[in-house]
């Protein structure tokens, strides 16, 4: 509520706005009859410098002129860009207890003259839009700077708008509020931007343009697609555009894709036929427009149209495999398995599969539809059987895939040789083989099939298989391969009407088993001891067991035990040993060995042979 300048005045020379690097003189003068009441000679004027309302300096030592008790002049230098506040105060030196009294203050602004505006760019959005121009102002002036945008054109057309920049707002764009119409398409227009502040002024170079240079069409709207005869691959894309548009760019892609299909369409008039779409696929479509074939700018992309193409009948062939087992004296169970079509082959939602089993000579046919990817039937063991499967969606069915039902491992001469299985990493196994040595018919293909060596349901846990061309002798199997599980792998060689196979076990990663086999019984027969055991539970095997070891030593002996190593066969659960002395008590135990090492020992059993050993 105090009038700060009641006691005196503050003036600045040469001006309150100065260029960067300049000095200024600030004079502080007391009004008549103002000052320290009793002793005018004790009047002391001080000048304080504030930046952002913070006192940064007392300019006591910068006095250049002093009329004692009346006025003082201070020189200020090295002022930083922007605004600095100076406050003059009166200090009555005889009264130490009273704080200095404000006399008056002044703001000095330090800045630079504006640079000529550059890179002027003008646009008019749509045929009915208005012209707006933007520019680069150059270096910040730190002063209030006025900008004037002037447009001139044919028929004495002139127009101008103004705006200013300061420390709160930036002016580098102005909308002139006028519309250029297409009938001025060939006319030339000139714009210039002038910048003025307290330290100077500058003008841009004139910027010349035509209607076509600056008008950006509005993006197309109301996009839709019509599929001809509900086709999944052909559709007509339609949209609305501004009247003057002569060129469109279309882009479209499946939603999970990373690259667009691009199409240029001239004089499309809001319609374009697409012929290479993928059926039953989610697509995204966008369109952009241009007013002139060679000049002008493209509009922004339209909003996306997202839609799914209709279904078409499936294409491609199903990958079929089978398993057959004799289930009584004159019947066999055929379990057919097939892999789902990939989306580009299914071309729609697969509703069911049509399965046919046919006995070729007697013309017996079993037919069924199923929604599963397997089908099981009991048929006579006699006759030559063939199976076919096709996939159906709402538009139709794929061509049936045929397979001859042969005895897959029936022909020894067709058995592949030197089958090996090597772990490649945690989740795959490399299987290699050599072709059959004396095949009496040509190998049409190899099938590599694998199953976990764990109890499983025949239908719930279908086989995994790979089809391999006849000139390939290796396969990398990875589907459903888990570490620490042993797989039985079969390589089938198939001719037109026969099959031969070879088996091997393999794992992708192994550890030593958790435990050894459990000895269940020791029996003596014909001067030999038979050791019987139960196998290690599957989860504890931790890979393929290569062999078992039976250890024995005399009870209480500190000698190393003897051992017998036997090849692992799941079907074997007993083994004879014949090097034990009669009427000597022995301790026996077993271990299991994988490629990673030996298990801890299983249970110990004591036994004292009675008969004559050896």
């Amino acid at each position: 509520n105090i009038d700060v300048c009641k006691l005196g005045t503050v003036t600045v020379q040469p001006a309150p706005v100065i260029p960067l690097g300049s000095a200024a003189n600030i004079s502080c003068s007391l009004n008549p009859k103002q000052g320290c009441s009793h002793y005018p000679s004790s009047n002391e004027l001080i000048l304080l410098k504030f930046v952002n309302d913070v006192l940064v300096e007392n300019l006591h030592g910068k006095k250049v002129h002093d009329h004692t008790g009346h006025s003082s002049t201070f020189q200020v230098t090295n002022l930083s860009l922007g605004m600095t506040l100076f406050v003059c105060k009166l200090n009555c030196s005889n009264s130490q207890k009273k704080p200095p009294v404000p006399v008056c203050g002044v703001e000095i602004s330090v800045g630079v003259a504006p640079e000529p505006p550059q890179n002027i760019s003008c646009v008019q959005e749509g045929e009915n839009g208005t012209v707006a121009c933007s520019w680069n102002s150059g270096k910040v002036t730190y002063l209030k700077t006025n900008y004037t945008l002037q447009l001139s054109g044919p028929n004495n057309l002139t127009c101008q708008k103004q705006c200013f920049s300061d420390n709160r707002q930036n002016c580098n764009r102005l909308d002139l509020g006028i519309n250029l119409s297409p009938d001025l398409a060939e006319s030339r227009f000139i714009v210039r931007v002038t910048a003025i502040n307290d330290l100077g002024n500058s003008s841009s170079l004139p910027h010349t343009f035509t209607f076509l240079d600056i008008v950006i069409p509005l993006p197309p709207w109301d996009i839709r697609i019509n599929f001809l005869n509900a086709s999944g691959s052909r559709g007509t894309l339609q949209w609305e555009d501004e009247g003057q548009v002569v060129l469109n760019q279309l882009r479209y892609q499946p939603l999970n894709s990373t690259s667009w299909n691009m199409v240029n369409a001239t004089n499309a008039k809001g319609k374009y036929d697409l012929r290479d779409l993928r059926p039953f696929t989610e697509y995204e479509f966008q369109i952009s427009s241009k007013l002139h074939l060679s000049g002008g700018s493209w509009s922004n992309w339209s909003e996306s149209l997202r839609t799914r193409t209709p279904e078409e009948e499936p294409v491609g062939i199903l990958d079929i495999w089978y398993m057959k087992q004799d289930i009584d004296y004159d019947r066999q169970q055929i379990s057919l398995f097939w892999k789902s079509l990939n989306p580009s082959e299914a071309r729609g939602k697969i509703l069911h599969y049509q399965v046919t089993l046919q006995e070729v000579t007697k013309k017996t046919t079993l037919q069924n539809t199923t929604r599963h990817t397997s089908w099981t039937r009991v048929i006579p063991r006699t006759g030559a059987w063939t199976a076919s499967v096709s996939a159906a969606n709402s538009k139709g069915a794929s061509a049936p895939t045929h397979i001859n039902i042969v005895d897959l491992c029936g022909t020894g001469l067709l058995a592949p040789h030197q089958v090996s299985a090597k772990s490649e990493n945690m989740d795959n196994i490399l299987v290699t083989w050599q072709p059959p040595k004396k095949a009496d018919s040509a190998v049409r293909e190899y099938i590599v099939e694998w199953r976990a060596l764990q109890p499983g349901s025949i239908t719930k846990f279908p086989p995994h298989w790979l089809r391999i061309p006849p000139d390939n002798m290796s396969a990398l199997i990875s589907e459903n391969i888990k570490p620490y599980i042993c797989y039985e792998i079969r390589v089938h060689a198939l001719s037109e009407s026969q099959g031969g196979c070879s088996s091997i076990r393999g794992d992708s990663k192994h550890k030593a088993p958790v435990s050894g086999p459990h000895i269940t019984a020791i029996t003596e027969k014909k001067e030999r001891l038979f050791i019987s055991w139960t196998h290690i539970p599957f989860p504890e095997q931790r890979g393929c067991i290569l062999h078992y070891r039976i250890y024995w030593k005399e009870r209480d002996s500190t000698a190393q035990p003897e051992l017998c190593e036997i090849q692992y066969r799941r079907s074997q659960n007993s083994h004879p040993i014949s090097s034990l002395q009669p009427r000597v008590t022995y301790v026996l135990w077993m271990t299991a060995v994988t490629a990673a090492g030996e298990s801890p020992q299983g249970n110990e059993r004591e036994f004292c042979p009675q008969g004559k050993a050896n």
């Epitope: 599963h372 199953r451 764990q454 109890p455 025949i458 846990f461 079969r490 088996s503 799941r570």
Partner: nanobody
Framework: QVQLQESGGGLVQAGGSLRLSCAAS????????MYWYRQAPGKQREFVAY???????NYLDSVNGRFTISRDNAKNSVYLQMNSLKPEDTAVYYC?????????????WGQGTQVTVSS
């Protein structure tokens, strides 16, 4: 190991019905494919019906339409409903479970239950 126990057999007149039951116990976590077989005196054992994990069923031609196989997973049981019985259906009926380990098929059998159809 898997244990199977059949029940429900007996003497019935031609045209009558019986319902056989088979209860499974033991290591049955991987048993999904269940079968009924029968063996008539002086003949070989023959397949009658099976039911898969996905409840797909298949029958011997001569019993198709008269016999129905079903299962109750909660009770670990499989059933054979036999209607319009004929004297030639007389046999010991066996429950069978198959599971696969690698490519080897392990089979488990029950003790059998006698079905006699009188004319």
């Amino acid at each position: 190991q898997v244990q199977l126990q059949e029940s429900g057999g007996g003497l019935v007149q031609a045209g009558g019905s019986l319902r056989l039951s088979c209860a499974a116990s033991g290591s049955i976590f991987a048993i999904d494919d269940m079968y009924w077989y029968r063996q008539a005196p002086g003949k070989q054992r023959e397949f009658v019906a099976y039911i898969t994990a996905t409840n797909s069923a298949n029958y011997l031609d001569s019993v198709n339409g008269r016999f129905t196989i079903s299962r109750d997973n909660a009770k670990n049981s499989v059933y054979l409903q036999m209607n319009s019985l004929k004297p030639e259906d007389t046999a010991v009926y066996y429950c069978n479970a198959k599971q696969i380990v690698g490519f080897q098929i392990d089979e488990y059998w029950g003790q059998g239950t006698q079905v006699t159809v009188s004319s």
